[in-house]
């Protein structure tokens, strides 16, 4: 769920998600539309697609709570729990490391980006 995601992103990136990523650009945070603004925004757009796929599979993406371990900078999704919990952890792990990979191109000006400026084709999943 959302608590797992927040904790994981903070552990991996070292940034407070609520201050740095939710929202950011056109796709980080709730909702998303238009062309992603940069690599970090692409991470979130891909994560939205990951969640959309799980929703079509009947998973409760915001409620399901999964177990994972964080050690030596790596995330290990526990093999405990349901299929949905496993897949949700995999989605969140991917976005966390994607955000970390793109810290060097993070743009403060895209923090709280005004969503009406998000134009262009929204990428398909």
């Amino acid at each position: 769920g959302i608590l797992n995601l927040n904790k994981m992103v903070k552990q991996v990136t070292g940034k407070m998600p609520i201050l740095s990523y939710w929202p950011y650009g056109c796709h980080c945070g709730l909702g998303g539309r238009g062309q992603p603004k940069d690599a970090t925004d692409w991470c979130c757009q891909t994560h939205d697609c990951c969640y959309d796929h799980l929703k079509t599979q009947g998973c409760s993406i915001y409620k399901d709570y999964y177990r994972y371990n964080f050690s030596q900078g790596n995330i290990h999704c526990s093999d405990k729990g349901s299929w949905c919990e496993q897949q949700l952890c995999a989605c969140d792990k991917e976005v966390a490391f994607c955000l970390k990979r793109n810290l060097d191109t993070y743009q403060k000006r895209l923090r709280f980006y005004w969503r009406p400026h998000c134009r262009g084709q929204t990428p398909g999943c």
Epitope: G58, S60, D64, D79, K80, G81, S82, W83
Partner: antibody, heavy 124, light 106 residues
């Protein structure tokens, strides 16, 4: 060779607490990833998952029965326990303990090993 | 929680006959698992991850399906196949079982 064996009181009165024991061999509950579930089956009816305990003492319960269930373990004695409080005649069933398959399979991969079951009758 | 509905509840088949047991889920699941249970015995794992036969299960058994519709098929019924078959999911918490299909030999 993995084996599990359940034991219980056989018969008990309504409103009492049911205490069940699962004694197992062929694996250790201290091994990472390991866990044991309790599942029950009223006579002539279907199966109902009750609870699960993991190697690290993490526990999961069936939401519909959670308030009445307590699962625990004694790793050194290779035993898992289940207590059900305030039983009534609807709790009359055969109770099984079961274990998931070996890695690389997951929790969601079902139950590969089952005990023989222990019949519990709750009298009014 | 996901409800699994098996059909038929009871059926009988002649030796050599093809048998199909269905399991319908109240919402989409990723995999289905099947168990065989004979009177006085505990359930045995029979099919895992929808279509994989457990160790020792005869090749006349097969499993298939996706989404909300799954099935177990016996290509040619034999006397030893008479048993109750249960489907099970753990797509979402908690794990749930179907009500069972009792298969009898004619």
């Amino acid at each position: 060779q993995v084996t599990l064996k359940e034991s219980g009181p056989g018969i008990l009165q309504s409103s009492q607490t049911l205490s069940l024991t699962c004694s197992f061999s062929g694996f250790s509950l201290s091994t990472s990833g390991m866990g044991v579930s309790w599942i029950r089956q009223p006579s002539g009816k279907g199966l109902e998952w009750l609870a699960h305990i993991y190697w690290d003492d993490d526990k999961r319960y069936n939401p519909s029965l959670k308030s009445r269930l307590t699962i625990s373990k004694d790793t050194s004695r290779n035993q898992v326990f289940l207590n059900i409080t305030s039983v009534d005649t609807a709790d009359t069933a055969t109770y099984y303990c079961a274990r998931r398959p070996e890695a690389p399979y997951y929790d969601y991969d079902g139950f590969a090993y089952w005990g023989q079951g222990t019949l519990v009758t709750v009298s009014a | 929680q996901i409800v699994l509905t098996q059909s038929p509840a009871i059926m009988s088949a002649s030796p050599g006959e093809k048998v199909t047991i269905s399991c319908s889920a109240s919402s989409s699941v990723s995999y289905m698992y099947w168990y065989q249970q004979k009177p006085g015995s505990s359930p045995k794992p029979w099919i895992y991850r929808t279509s994989n036969l457990a160790s020792g299960v005869p090749a006349r058994f097969s499993g298939s399906g996706s989404g909300t519709s799954y099935s177990l098929t016996i290509s040619s019924m034999e006397a030893e196949d008479a048993a109750t078959y249960y489907c099970q999911q753990y797509h979402t918490y908690p794990p749930t079982f179907g009500g069972g299909t009792k298969l009898e030999i004619k």
